[in-house]
Amino acid sequence: AYRPSETLCGGELVDTLQFVCGDRGFYFSRPASRVSRRSRGIVEECCFRSCDLALLETYCATPAKSE
């Protein structure tokens, strides 16, 4: 289960992403946006600083279907 406000690395990061994203799948980096020239990947954002559920969800592969 996801525990907020902690760093997540390695297998724990993978397992947490699988839990959060479920069937949607996930990826470890996002395309660079126009706003920031360099897009940080999830390892930078979660392994070396606290990351929350909302941030983790941005790495899920496709949006959850709304019922």
Epitope: T7, C9, G10, E12, E44
Partner: antibody, heavy 127, light 107 residues
Framework: EVQLLESGGGLVQPGGSLRLSCAAS????????MIWVRQAPGKGLEWVSS???????KYADSVKGRFTISRDNSKNTLYLQMNSLRAEDTAVYYC?????????????????????WGQGTMVTVSS | DIQMTQSPSSLSASAGDRVTITCRAS??????LNWYQQKPGKAPNLLIY???NLQGGVPSRFSGSGSGTDFTLTISSLQPEDFATYYC?????????FGGGTKVEIK
């Protein structure tokens, strides 16, 4: 040939400093986590520190604040600066290659282990 | 921190024997468990990663299994070159931790 070669070990007095180096060859050094692991005489393996390709670091509690891991990707070299050395730091120090920076390869395959090791360098802390 | 406990700490066996070494984690580490072999005076060598994946060049007599907290390394038919010390290591979270080792000796 994929290879890691440590240097810089030796005898140092308690409270002293030492800098270990690990020269890498045969692979794209800048893409990988790199690791220091140590082994006290007659004892098991102990993880010391890890550094990601872009320089972020992790340390064992036993060395935090005393040891600093760093790397020079342009020289394919990993370093371990050891300060305030103690008798319990006496060990063979190994550098090892860890996983790719983001753990996954281009085909989406997860890997997190130490697959390439150096031959080790002995550090003795004694007065 | 995740503690890794190996058993037995040592064992005596003969060439041709089937050998099993166990590793237990203090909390679930899913499948993120690696095994290394170390011979005296040499660096460790990766045998198996992520529980059951054989590293390139490692003989097929080595195999790994388990999940969660309990893991096993099996050598199906011990060869003279297999007499060594074996370590498990968890790759689940920092700090990365190793088991205490299992020394496989000649009977």
């Amino acid at each position: 040939e994929v290879q890691l070669l440590e240097s810089g070990g030796g005898l140092v007095q308690p409270g002293g400093s030492l800098r270990l180096s690990c020269a890498a060859s045969g692979f794209t050094f800048s893409r990988y986590w790199m690791i220091w692991v140590r082994q006290a005489p007659g004892k098991g393996l102990e993880w010391v520190s890890s550094i990601r390709s872009s320089g972020e670091t992790k340390y064992a509690d036993s060395v935090k604040g005393r040891f600093t891991i760093s790397r020079d990707n342009s020289k394919n070299t990993l370093y371990l600066q050891m300060n305030s050395l103690r008798a319990e730091d006496t060990a063979v120090y190994y550098c090892a290659r860890g996983p790719l920076s983001d753990y996954y390869d281009s085909s989406g395959y997860y890997f997190d282990a130490f697959d390439i090791w150096g031959q080790g360098t002995m550090v003795t802390v004694s007065s | 921190d995740i503690q890794m406990t190996q058993s037995p700490s040592s064992l005596s066996a003969s060439a041709g024997d089937r050998v099993t070494i166990t590793c237990r984690a203090s909390q679930s580490i899913s499948s993120y468990l690696n095994w290394y072999q170390q011979k005296p005076g040499k660096a460790p060598n990766l045998l198996i990663y992520t529980t059951s994946n054989l590293q390139g060049g490692v003989p097929s007599r080595f195999s790994g299994s388990g999940s969660g907290t309990d893991f096993t390394l099996t050598i199906s038919s011990l060869q003279p070159e297999d007499f060594a010390t074996y370590y498990c290591q968890q790759g689940y979270s920092f700090p990365l931790t190793f088991g205490g080792g299992t020394k496989v000796e000649i009977k």
